[in-house]
């Protein structure tokens, strides 16, 4: 990142507030799901590792016209310190693997709950 002319730095591990709010929103989406989420749109699967918030946003931002995940997209942008736009491809995506948005949200939710339990808020 230093080649960009500035530098990105991780902050201290923040309180659990932000992560809890994101988890609550994902729970809300999964529980209120009536028809297929986002009309069954497919998104790139991601590696749930370091940098996953940016990767998740890069994946979900390619879904347009789906109000159910707009708040999630906005919340993820508050975790990711760089500018994300539709059409980007992250090295954290699992190449050639696409899954439905509903499955993506479930996978992300399970992982975030695990992080929350372990106290890894960053």
């Amino acid at each position: 990142l230093t080649c960009l002319g500035g530098f990105a730095s991780p902050g201290p591990v923040p309180p659990s507030t932000a992560l809890r709010e994101l988890i609550e929103e994902l729970v809300n989406i999964t529980q209120n799901q009536k028809a297929p989420l986002c009309n069954g749109s497919m998104v790139w699967s991601i590696n749930l590792t370091a940098g996953m918030y940016c990767a998740a946003l890069e994946s979900l931002i390619n879904v347009s016209g789906c109000s159910a995940i707009e708040k999630t997209q906005r919340m993820l942008s508050g975790f990711c310190p760089h500018k994300v736009s539709a059409g980007q491809f992250s090295s954290l995506h699992v190449r050639d693997t696409k899954i439905e948005v509903a499955q993506f949200v479930k996978d992300l939710l399970l992982h975030l709950k695990k992080l929350f339990r372990e106290g890894q808020f960053n």
Epitope: L4, G5, G6, F7, A8, S9, P10, G11, P12, V13, P14, T17, A18, L19, E21, L22, Y53, K71, Q73, R74, M75, L76, S77, G78, F79, C80, P81, K83, V84, S85, G87, Q88, N122
Partner: antibody, heavy 120, light 112 residues
């Protein structure tokens, strides 16, 4: 309505440090970046850096890397800038501004600014 | 760092006139994601800056349609079709594509 309320003006001695605050209200604090901008008297604007409140990660202007440290307290919806080893060059108005994902990260709301005067 | 050069430094106008401010970047300001993060802000005397235009040509909510932004690559322009008294102040262009993000030096719009 969206508001960014900044702490009061400060008079500090050379070599001292100061911590300025920016309290957000009227929106979900952790969903929007907070940028910090410096404006010296009668001068233009300089971008110091921004912080993603959800993760606490920052992007900083290298010119300020030994001068400014950006942090947030998500429990009180407050962003902070800690300025250290102050000199007359640091006398300026410091603004916080929200970076909005909805408007392609543009700074859509600004605080009123905090004036810092460095003088012995 | 990307240098943003605004011209003119000062722009005296009569109310009702058209005004045009130019902003030139020292290098292309297309972000690696393909977007051009070029914004325009107005700072009225004694106030905080306010967002007018984002992503080159998009007007922010509540900004009158007499304001328009255009340009690409390294050359950008802000036009005000009919200047009103509330438009007076200093206009800044800003690039948010390459870190460190940078502002232009400002253009002061004043009454002739």
């Amino acid at each position: 309505q969206v508001q960014l309320q900044q702490s009061g003006d400060d008079l500090v001695k050379p070599g001292a440090s100061v911590k300025l605050s920016c309290k957000a209200s009227g929106y979900t604090f952790t969903s929007y970046w907070i940028n910090w901008i410096k404006q010296r008297p009668g001068q233009g604007l300089e971008w110091i850096g921004h912080i993603a409140p959800g993760s606490g990660e920052t992007y900083d202007n290298e010119m300020f890397k030994d001068k400014a440290k950006l942090t947030v307290d998500t429990s009180s919806n407050t962003a902070y800038i800690h300025l250290s080893s102050l000199s007359s060059e640091d006398s300026a108005v410091y603004f916080c501004a929200r970076g909005s994902f909805t408007f392609f990260y543009a700074m859509d709301y600004w605080g009123q600014g905090t004036s810092v005067t460095v003088s012995s | 760092d990307v240098l943003m050069t605004q011209t003119p430094l000062s722009l005296p106008v009569s109310l009702g006139d058209q005004a045009s401010i130019s902003c030139r970047s020292s290098q292309n300001i297309v972000h690696s994601n393909g977007k051009t993060y070029l914004e325009w802000y107005l700072q009225r005397p004694g106030q905080s800056p306010k967002l007018l235009i984002y992503k080159v040509s998009n007007r922010f909510s509540g900004v009158p349609d007499r304001f328009s932004g255009s340009g690409s690559g390294t050359d950008f322009t802000l036009k005000i079709s009919r200047v009103e008294a509330e438009d007076l102040g200093v206009y800044y262009c800003f690039q948010g594509s390459h870190v460190p993000y940078t502002f232009g030096g400002g253009t002061k719009l004043e009454i002739k």
